[in-house]
């Protein structure tokens, strides 16, 4: 918990303007929730709901708040110490090497496969060949049998900073 | 339950220095900010300073940061805070509060240490 | 430093009034301001944080508003146990700073 994050670890986009760049304060560092003043003298508080810090810092700005995208619902709202958790809609899902979007879920498996796992909001409907049971990727064949998946699951903290 | 235990009321002539301890209990000592805050006789509060044992990190208010210094002894969960210099106005209550890492908003509160300054 | 100006300083109230005492911060605070009651004699306690959210088991009757520089807690049906000095406190900047009181008591 007392990690701490600084301007060299950030995003370039995240990280303050050079000329408002500045060596680490004699004073130390600000606590999660808070960002350090200009002069290096005072923390102050990221504002609730726009923008937070998860780590003492000597960040000059705390970072911007995530908003849900359409798509997606708010599992639990941005406070000055933690970003927003955003997860896929019911029957939608989020691909690893595709994070920026959620995609729908298939709805039913191929034939000669059976589905072995559910519809998430961090993963598509599992299919596993009948005999081999070797898993199928790839993407949706044209034609699909009518085995149809339950896209009800629990909850995941899939947060994105965005 | 979380309590906040300070030490005895002192008695100090004007130019001595006085130590005033806090011992936590009834939660992770090192996951909360803890504070110093006085209180001069029928006055208001007054926010000196702070000590995270996650990290060592003390802040001072500038007002004190001349004449305060605030320690702990993670073994015992206790924070110290030594005010040096003593003058009359010195003269209150000193509590020491904690917050949680996030907003600094005092959750809960030692009992308070009096301090006299007095020739 | 921010300086918070409590008003009134002193505040005579009836069980069952409805009170309202006010908090202006010397600059913007955002929402940063927080609600202490003190007893004599006694520690403050929590009852207001994020000039709204109400403390855990501070009762209903509490209630905190404001934004930027002013702020108000009321207290909807004073008990005689609400009797104490109420702090308005900023935790936007350090040093963080406290208005000077106001004193409630029973008419």
């Known amino acids: 918990e007392s990690a701490l994050i600084t301007q060299q670890d950030l995003a370039p986009q995240q990280r303050a303007a050079p000329q408002q760049k500045r060596s680490s304060p004699s004073e130390g560092l600000c606590p999660p929730g808070h960002h350090i003043s200009e002069d290096g003298r005072d923390c102050i508080s990221c504002k609730y709901g726009q923008d937070y810090s998860t780590h003492w810092n000597d960040l000059l700005f705390c970072l911007r708040c995530t908003r849900c995208d359409s798509g997606e619902v708010e599992l639990s709202p941005c406070t000055t110490t933690r970003n927003t958790v955003c997860q896929c809609e019911e029957g939608t899902f989020r691909e690893e090497d595709s994070p920026e979007m959620c995609r729908k879920c298939r709805t039913g498996c191929p034939r000669g496969m059976v589905k072995v796992g559910d519809c998430t909001p961090w993963s598509d409907i599992e299919c596993v060949h009948k005999e081999s049971g070797t898993k199928h990727s790839g993407e949706v064949p044209a034609v699909e049998e009518t085995v149809t998946s339950s896209p009800g699951t629990p909850a995941s903290p899939c947060s994105l900073s965005g | 339950q979380v309590q906040l235990v300070q030490s005895g009321a002192e008695v100090k002539k004007p130019g001595a220095s006085v130590k005033v301890s806090c011992k936590a209990s009834?939660?992770?000592?090192?996951?909360?900010?803890l504070h110093w805050v006085r209180q001069a006789p029928g006055q208001g509060l007054e926010w000196m300073g702070w000590?995270?044992?996650?990290?060592?990190?003390?802040k001072y208010n500038e007002k004190f940061k001349d004449r305060v210094t605030i320690t702990a002894d993670k073994s015992t969960s206790t924070v110290y805070m030594e005010l040096s210099s003593l003058r009359s106005e010195d003269t209150a209550v000193y509590y020491c509060?904690?917050?949680?890492?996030?907003?600094?908003?005092?959750?809960?509160w030692g009992q308070g240490t009096l301090v006299t300054v007095s020739s | 430093d921010i300086q918070m100006t409590q008003s009134p300083s002193f505040l005579s109230a009836s069980v069952g009034d409805r009170v309202t005492i006010t908090c202006r911060a010397s600059?913007?605070?955002?929402?940063?301001v927080a609600w202490y009651q003190q007893k004599p004699g006694k520690a403050p306690k929590l009852l207001i944080y994020?000039?709204?959210t109400r403390h855990t088991g501070v009762p209903s009757r509490f209630s905190g508003s404001g934004s930027g520089t002013d702020f108000t807690l009321t207290i909807s049906s004073l008990q005689p146990e609400d009797i104490a000095t109420y702090y308005c406190q900023q935790h936007y900047i350090t040093p963080w700073t406290f208005g000077g009181g106001t004193k409630l008591e029973i008419k």
């Open positions: 509060a904690r917050h949680e890492q996030g907003p600094g908003y005092f959750d809960y």
């Open positions: 000590f995270y044992p996650g990290n060592n990190n003390i």
């Open positions: 009834g939660y992770t000592f090192t996951e909360y900010i």
């Open positions: 994020w000039a709204s």
């Open positions: 600059q913007d605070v955002n929402t940063a």
